[in-house]
């Protein structure tokens, strides 16, 4: 038997993926475990193999269908179970009734690009990936810019309280290398959380013209 504290957390990307992490203090090290998803309104079910991500936590992705297919809706409830092999049988280690649209975490924004750059400002755009049509415009974004000599953690957060897939960064230093990241969150869902940060976009401001004030 496994003793200790267990935590089983899953998020739906709003289309066709449920990502789960299972943590167990004093967990079995060499045991095969999986997550099984059983929607109560659907004819399909899905399984993924839990793989170690640290000493006492495992993760896996339930791929429900084609990336942009709408496999679950606001009224679906999915029974999620962690099953671990014990000899010839499977033992239920954790179970939850999962409401997908109460537990959302979207994919990181993609296709970041510099639309226009000047000496002191830069206009950047991006796209959201695999986001449900249910949200319409009910999304918000956070962005951050990495300045030379600073860390991401020190970067101030810029909040966009609407579905706005661009930003104009102001008061930048001329001829300076920056990096930019953005993340997205639906307004819907009691346990919804921010997406991962996008891949950083590197850009450089234009040098100040000679003889001009900066």
């Amino acid at each position: 038997a496994v003793n200790g504290t267990s935590q089983f957390t899953c998020f739906y990307n709003s289309r066709a993926n449920i990502s789960c992490v299972w943590s167990q203090d004093g967990a079995l090290q060499d045991t095969s475990c999986q997550v099984h998803a059983w929607p109560d309104r659907r004819r399909w079910n899905q399984t993924c193999e839990l793989l170690p991500v640290s000493q006492a936590s495992w993760a896996c992705n339930l791929i429900l269908g084609a990336p942009d297919s709408q496999k679950l809706t606001t009224v679906d409830i999915v029974t999620l179970r962690v099953l671990c092999r014990e000899g010839v049988r499977w033992r239920v280690m954790a179970i939850q009734d999962f409401k997908p649209f109460e537990n959302l975490r979207l994919m990181a924004p993609i296709s970041l690009q510099v639309v226009h750059v000047e000496t002191h400002r830069c206009n950047i755009s991006w796209e959201i990936s695999q986001a449900s049509h249910y949200f319409e415009r009910h999304l918000e974004f956070e962005a951050r810019t990495l300045s030379p000599g600073h860390t991401w953690e020190e970067a101030p957060l810029l909040t966009l309280k609407q579905k706005q897939e661009w930003i104009c960064l102001e008061t930048l230093t001329p001829d300076t290398q920056y990096e930019f990241q953005v993340r997205v969150k639906p307004l819907q869902g009691e346990f919804t959380t921010w997406s991962p940060w996008s891949q950083p976009l590197a850009f450089r401001t234009k040098p100040a013209a000679l003889g001009k004030d900066t």
Epitope: D40, R41, S69, V75, I77
Partner: antibody, heavy 112, light 107 residues
């Protein structure tokens, strides 16, 4: 073999009440959401209500909201529909259903 | 609510004919569309689930296709026992909604 066996239909006066039952067998009842669907004489099908597998979530058609209550007893593998304040327009054959399996239907007649 | 528009409302056919019935949804329902056969005084019988999957025990002359908003039920060679009413159901989201039905009659 999957079976959904219905009972509880009959003749009732307007304003009256009736409770329909649907006994399930041949599948893991608690793993499936269940619905009630009705069909008025000579008409098409109309969804009435649904309940999640655990019973914790319910949904109703606007036409029955506040009058009908869906419930389930997973220990008895049984689905229920409590119908109150019945009207003439509720007259229909009522089916308990999942998309794959339907009960045999039970006739509810609301008439004075 | 999602509307399902089924056509034709009726058709006349002979044994051995190929029959095609269509169902169009007012918005995308992914692949969550089911087809049923109903005979007078009987409960509906499931034929196809999730747009294209044949229910257990249903003859292979029945097939379904489509996704998003446009769906088709095809009977490749109509048999005497196939004369009935057919309808589609979306179970993508509540409320479930149904097509108006297609009555397949003897020519």
């Amino acid at each position: 073999e999957v079976q959904l066996v219905q009972s509880g239909g009959g003749l009732v006066q307007p304003g009256g009440s009736l409770r329909l039952s649907c006994a399930a067998s041949g599948f893991t009842f608690s793993s499936y959401a269940m619905s009630w669907v009705r069909q008025a004489p000579g008409k098409g099908l109309e969804w009435v209500s649904a309940i999640s597998g655990s019973g914790g979530s319910t949904h109703y058609a606007d036409s029955v909201k506040g009058r009908f209550t869906i419930s389930r007893d997973n220990s008895k593998n049984t689905l229920y529909l409590q119908m109150n304040s019945l009207r003439a327009e509720d007259t229909a054959v009522y089916y308990c259903a999942t998309p794959a399996f339907w009960g045999q239907g039970t006739l509810v007649t609301v008439s004075s | 609510d999602i509307q399902l528009t089924q056509s034709p409302s009726s058709l006349s056919a002979s044994v051995g004919d190929r029959v095609t019935i269509t169902c169009r949804a007012s918005q995308s329902i992914s692949s969550y569309l089911n087809w049923y056969q109903q005979k007078p005084g009987k409960a509906p019988k499931a034929l196809i689930y999730d747009a294209s999957n044949l229910e257990t025990g249903v003859p292979s002359r029945f097939s379904g296709s489509g996704s998003g908003t446009d769906f088709t039920l095809t009977i490749i060679s109509l048999q005497p026992e196939d004369f009935a009413t057919y309808f589609c159901l979306q179970d993508y989201i509540y409320p479930w909604t149904f097509g108006q039905g297609t009555k397949v009659e003897f020519k």
